[in-house]
């Protein structure tokens, strides 16, 4: 699987999950989140050659099409597969609130 | 929705489904399929700017991150959303077989 275990410990050039830290205030302009100040969101990057973690029959077909037509603009793309939630704390007035933000952290990628 | 109805009738520059005809023999090297000779597979292409058909909370965050960090390599990607099957006919000896190939035709796209 193109997950953090494999991708973070390798120098994989093809589609893989990459490290990305997002600071809520600086990178998103969200000043109201109290904790955490930011988080390891990660992102997906890298080419999707034929047979590389292809998601559907269609992505297999497209990768094969690409092999026969190397200059074509139609190609599978490296996108998130498994996503995890992130708990945050913010204040409503003086009252702290804990919210679980769904689908915030990329754990693995796929070619789609 | 970034579907064939909208995308094929517009000159949309952002992520949208585009027309692509795949010839089984020429483009995939599949000589064994009897019917059809090829099909309209379509493909997804175009940038994924802020707010453009974002798939998950993560893709919203990434699009917002991109607005604050325009040079970043982390960005949502335009990929298939709705896929449809394709019926094919091939021969096993002299006996024709009909097979439904799942997820073969792109009907709409999303930014993931």
């Amino acid at each position: 699987a193109l997950d953090t275990n494999y991708c973070f410990s390798s120098t994989e050039k093809n589609c893989c999950v990459r490290q990305l830290y997002i600071d809520f205030r600086k990178d998103l302009g969200w000043k109201w989140i109290h904790e955490p100040k930011g988080y390891h969101a990660n992102f997906c990057l890298g080419p999707c050659p034929y047979i590389w973690s292809l998601d559907t029959q269609y992505s297999k077909v497209l990768a094969l099409y690409n092999q026969h037509n190397p200059g074509a603009s139609a190609a599978p793309c490296c996108v998130p597969q498994a996503l995890e939630p992130l708990p945050i704390v913010y204040y409503v007035g003086r009252k702290p609130k804990v919210e679980q933000l769904s689908n915030m952290i990329v754990r693995s990628c796929k070619c789609s | 929705a970034l579907d064939t109805n909208y995308c094929f009738s517009s000159t949309e520059k952002n992520c949208c489904v585009r027309q692509l005809y795949i010839d089984f023999r020429k483009d995939l090297g599949w000589k064994w399929i009897h019917e059809p000779k090829g099909y309209h597979a379509n493909f997804c292409l175009g940038p994924c700017p802020y707010i453009w058909s974002l798939d998950t909370q993560y893709s919203k965050v990434l699009a917002l991150y991109n607005q604050h960090n325009p040079g970043a390599s982390a960005a949502p990607c335009c990929v298939p959303q709705a896929l449809e099957p394709l019926p094919i006919v091939y021969y096993v000896g002299r006996k024709p077989k009909v097979e439904q190939l799942s997820n073969m035709i792109v009907r709409s796209c999303k930014c993931s």
Epitope: L28, G29, W30, K31, W32, Y90, Y91, V92, G93, R94, K95, K97, E99, L101 | Y50, I51, Q57, K60, V61, L64, Q67
Partner: antibody, heavy 121, light 107 residues
Framework: EVQLVQSGAEVKKPGASVKVSCKTS????????MNWVRQAPGAGLDWMGQ????????NYNEMFEGRVTLTADTSTSTAYMELSSLRAGDIAVYYC??????????????WGQGTLVTVSS | DIVMTQTPPSLSVSPRETASISCRAS??????????MHWYLQKPGQSPQLLIY???NLESGVSDRFSGSGSGTDFTLRISRVEANDTGVYYC?????????FGQGTK
């Protein structure tokens, strides 16, 4: 230029629901909380609640007894306020107002033009 | 809930004079070194507009004839060299405690 443009005036029967829209432009919709405030004829301002559009996270004023529902559509940068079980006491101008951005509850720096809701049998 | 009480309920001021409006909160609205008190003006037939945030900060684009002061429970909005265009209802608002609340207004 930041703009919040609300839907037109509504006339509703008692017991019915009303849904008011607030279409925004000129800023990043997903960066700010959106508040809803109402003003009865000749009266002051009452805060109804707020939504953070990127997640649909909401905080409501208990005064509205669960009758108010706030939603947002990030694809069109539009916020919505639905008020159910309408009664005569709900006759008011309803405003959407953007939060200043430093806190969830905050000052409100941009306001819609207001939507008059009339309840009449 | 924090109750905001404004005085006076209405005020008539001659041009070029100074006007003062008071707002008293039923409990302190100070937290983390800030006073969570803001002031708005609602001109006839218009939506409210933010004048002062966090007790004393002038909102961008607002005339510097407006100034705010105070902390804890007692706050004041001052308008110097009053103009006819300043006519309207002035509201204070706190966001230190949920629910956010407004004063009843000073006309």
């Amino acid at each position: 230029e930041v703009q919040l443009v609300q839907s037109g005036a509504e006339v509703k029967k008692p017991g019915a629901s009303v849904k008011v829209s607030c279409k925004t432009s000129g800023y990043i919709f997903m960066k700010y909380w959106m508040n809803w405030v109402r003003q009865a004829p000749g009266a002051g301002l009452d805060w109804m609640g707020q939504i953070f559009p990127a997640w649909g996270m909401t905080n409501y004023n208990e005064m509205f007894e669960g009758r108010v529902t706030l939603t947002a559509d990030t694809s069109t940068s539009t916020a919505y306020m639905e008020l159910s079980s309408l009664r005569a006491g709900d006759i008011a101008v309803y405003y959407c107002a953007r939060g200043y951005g430093n806190y969830a509850l905050d000052a409100m720096d941009y306001w819609g033009q207001g939507t008059l809701v009339t309840v009449s049998s | 809930d924090i109750v905001m009480t404004q005085t006076p309920p209405s005020l008539s001021v001659s041009p070029r004079e100074t006007a003062s409006i008071s707002c008293r909160a039923s409990e302190s609205v100070d937290s983390y070194g800030n006073s969570f008190m803001h002031w708005y003006l609602q001109k006839p037939g218009q939506s409210p507009q933010l004048l002062i945030y966090l007790a004393s900060n002038l909102e961008s684009g607002v005339s510097d004839r407006f100034s705010g002061s105070g902390s804890g429970t007692d706050f004041t909005l001052r308008i110097s060299r009053v103009e006819a265009n300043d006519t309207g209802v002035y509201y204070c608002q706190q966001n230190d405690e949920d629910p956010l609340s407004f004063g009843q207004g000073t006309k």
